[in-house]
Amino acid sequence: YFPQVFGKSNDGFVPTESYGTTSVQNVSQIFGRNDESTMPTRSYGTVCPRNWDFHQGKCFFFSFSESPWKDSMDYCATQGSTLAIVNTPEKLKYLQDIAGIENYFIGLVRQPGEKKWRWINNSVFNGNVTNQDQNFDCVTIGLTKTYDAASCEVSYRWICEMNAK
């Protein structure tokens, strides 16, 4: 169970420089089962908390500090958000462009004892994860421009995501 991806109140939220609305993108087959094309077009808000980046109806927080995956997830939860679910090519490119040469934990993990990679909403990821033969169960994005398996216990930066208001 994860907290809702909405902030608890408007406290700390400020309008971003980006305005307007945007519709959901279709998901390529590898980013999860090709389901999102069934979703209706809908409008999103444009307001994010301070120090969060707005993009296509979502707010993203890029940490400067580093933590293990579990602590990163807990931090996002305290902000009323989750680790980022990077399930479209466009979203991946946007986040990688900001990540630059740093590696950031995202909300993609492999359950110990299960071969499948899943997003933290439990949906299956059908794409390629590099370094997964090393028994790493968490994933980072950034420097290599791919989904990289990483040790959940090693500290990395992380990306939180929530719906814009």
Partner: antibody
Amino acid sequence: QSLEESGGGLVKPEGSLTLTCKASGFTLSSYYYMCWVRQAPGKGLEWIACIYAGSSGTTVYASWAKGRFTISKTSSTTVTLQMTSLTAADTATYLCARKLGDVGYGHTTYFNLWGPGTLVTVSS
Amino acid sequence: ALVMTQTPSSVSAAVGGTVTIKCQASQNIYSTLAWYQQKPGQPPKLLMFDASDLASGVPSRFKGSGSGTEYTLTISDLEPADAATYFCQTYYDSGSDDLNAFGGGTEVVVK
């Protein structure tokens, strides 16, 4: 590997009852969530609550179950469900079920092991 | 709340025939769907997960399909032992408390 429920029976309205689920062939540890699901006579399945079997004991409840139902891990092989303020609508077979899951990784997926259930009848 | 609507409530077919059971979610559940078989007096048994993956020991006569909000369980070459009630369940975590929603069930009668 198996699960067995106990503690069911006849209880009066507004009464309380505690059900127990005992695991055999495995221990309640990391990688599992233990859950309770109920089934009214001739009806469908209704999820009640889950508890992470690892050390954190994280719990999650169906919204309708909060306050009247409490799930607990009482040993390395047992989970309980405390029920209060029971009404006739709570009459059902209560099933213990196991889910693959790790609180550190967020996954609580499908139920891959079930007990046979214990019948709870609420009647005056 | 996430609601799973299962149809039909009952279906009948002859031995060797085929039955199709549908499950519709009130929102996109991204293939986080399981199917269970329950016989009278017994607990449910996992048949399928992630919409189309067979659980261990389940014959390939059982086939799951679907995406988005629409999912189907197809049982072909029906056998008498397939007579049971079938339930769908989603484990999609949308961030709300109401996880693990079940469909209402479909009774399969084998003639």
